[in-house]
């Protein structure tokens, strides 16, 4: 889980190892702050929980791509 001790900067110190389906993911944000020890992606799930993930992992990149496309596609 993300850690916001030095609010308002949120950092990730550990990444999930588990692959998560895009079915559970609602949105994401990238963590690129120099105040954080590593670059990260924080996924927000459909039940509003936050998960730290490694942006170098393929499933994470695929999930971000999917969410980007979902955002671009207007709902009918």
């Amino acid at each position: 889980q993300p850690d916001a001790i030095n609010a308002p900067v949120t950092c990730c110190y550990n990444f999930t190892n588990r692959k998560i389906s895009v079915q559970r993911l609602a949105s994401y944000r990238r963590i690129t702050s120099s105040k954080c020890p590593k670059e990260a992606v924080i996924f927000k799930t459909i039940v509003a929980k936050e998960i730290c993930a490694d942006p170098k992992q393929k499933w994470v990149q695929d999930s971000m791509d999917h969410l980007d496309k979902q955002t671009q596609t207007p709902k009918t």
Epitope: Q1, T16, N17, R18, K19, I20, S21, V22, Q23, R24, A26, T45, I46, V47, K49, I51, W59, Q70, K75
Partner: antibody, heavy 119, light 113 residues
Framework: QVQLVQSGAEVKKPGASVKVSCKVS????????MHWVRQAPGKGLEWMGG????????IYAQKFQGRVTMTEDTSTDTAYMELSSLRSEDTAVYYC????????????WGQGTLVTVSS | DIVMTQSPASLAESLGERATINCKSS????????????LVWYQQKLGQPPKLLIY???TRESGVPDRFSGSGSGTDFTLTISSLQAEDVAVYYC?????????FGQGTKVEIK
């Protein structure tokens, strides 16, 4: 493709504990979110618990809290479910179940392990 | 917890007839942002583990015959077998996967009349 192979049938006395194993192949266990579901004879499916990446930890159904422990041996890609203080109502087939990307449902199941609790 | 209630408990239809199973959730399992229902259907044959048939309430898993269809939204869902075959004799379960704890319906046994 994920494959799950469970340990064999067990007969236990009331009050004892049982430990069921589930060996993963095709994936490493740490990539998966392994869960356990049981089914008493002639009854329905009952989720017991499993690793929830949204919480970052193993979560348990309230009914089994304090009596069940789910662990992982990442060196052998084997998941374990230990149930203690067994009673006759715990007689059931116990399944490990998962999917390649955690979604909240299960498309890969072990073959099941029958645990019989009898004096 | 989200409680799942299935009906009927059992049903018997003739070969080639339609079989309909209902599943009701105590809370909505519709996520409005993507308009998807977080509900799956499983088929369990005697002595076997369950097999996933349908996810997102209406999307068939690959390899599942098209006589199986899922419908419904929010709290009320239906699994339909359009033309019952001998190999469809099984118990069918719904499960919500919107939020933990993951909960199942009590099952519907489908037999041939």
């Amino acid at each position: 493709q994920v494959q799950l192979v469970q340990s064999g049938a067990e007969v236990k006395k009331p009050g004892a504990s049982v430990k069921v194993s589930c060996k993963v192949s095709g994936y490493t266990l740490t990539e998966l979110s392994m869960h356990w579901v049981r089914q008493a004879p002639g009854k329905g499916l009952e989720w017991m618990g499993g690793f929830d990446p949204e919480d970052g930890e193993t979560i348990y159904a309230q009914k089994f809290q304090g009596r069940v422990t789910m662990t992982e041996d990442t060196s052998t890609d084997t998941a374990y479910m230990e149930l203690s203080s067994l009673r006759s109502e715990d007689t059931a087939v116990y399944y490990c179940a998962t999917n390649e990307f955690w979604s909240g449902y299960f498309d890969y199941w072990g073959q099941g392990t029958l645990v019989t609790v009898s004096s | 917890d989200i409680v799942m209630t299935q009906s009927p408990a059992s049903l018997a239809e003739s070969l080639g007839e339609r079989a309909t199973i209902n599943c009701k959730s105590s809370q909505s399992v519709l996520y409005s942002s993507n308009n998807k229902n977080y509900l799956v259907w499983y088929q369990q044959k005697l002595g076997q583990p369950p097999k996933l048939l349908i996810y997102w309430a209406s999307t068939r898993e690959s390899g599942v015959p098209d006589r199986f269809s899922g419908s419904g939204s929010g709290t009320d869902f239906t699994l339909t077998i359009s033309s019952l075959q001998a190999e469809d004799v099984a118990v069918y379960y719904c499960q919500q996967y919107y939020r933990s704890p993951w909960t199942f319906g009590q099952g519907t046994k489908v037999e041939i009349k």
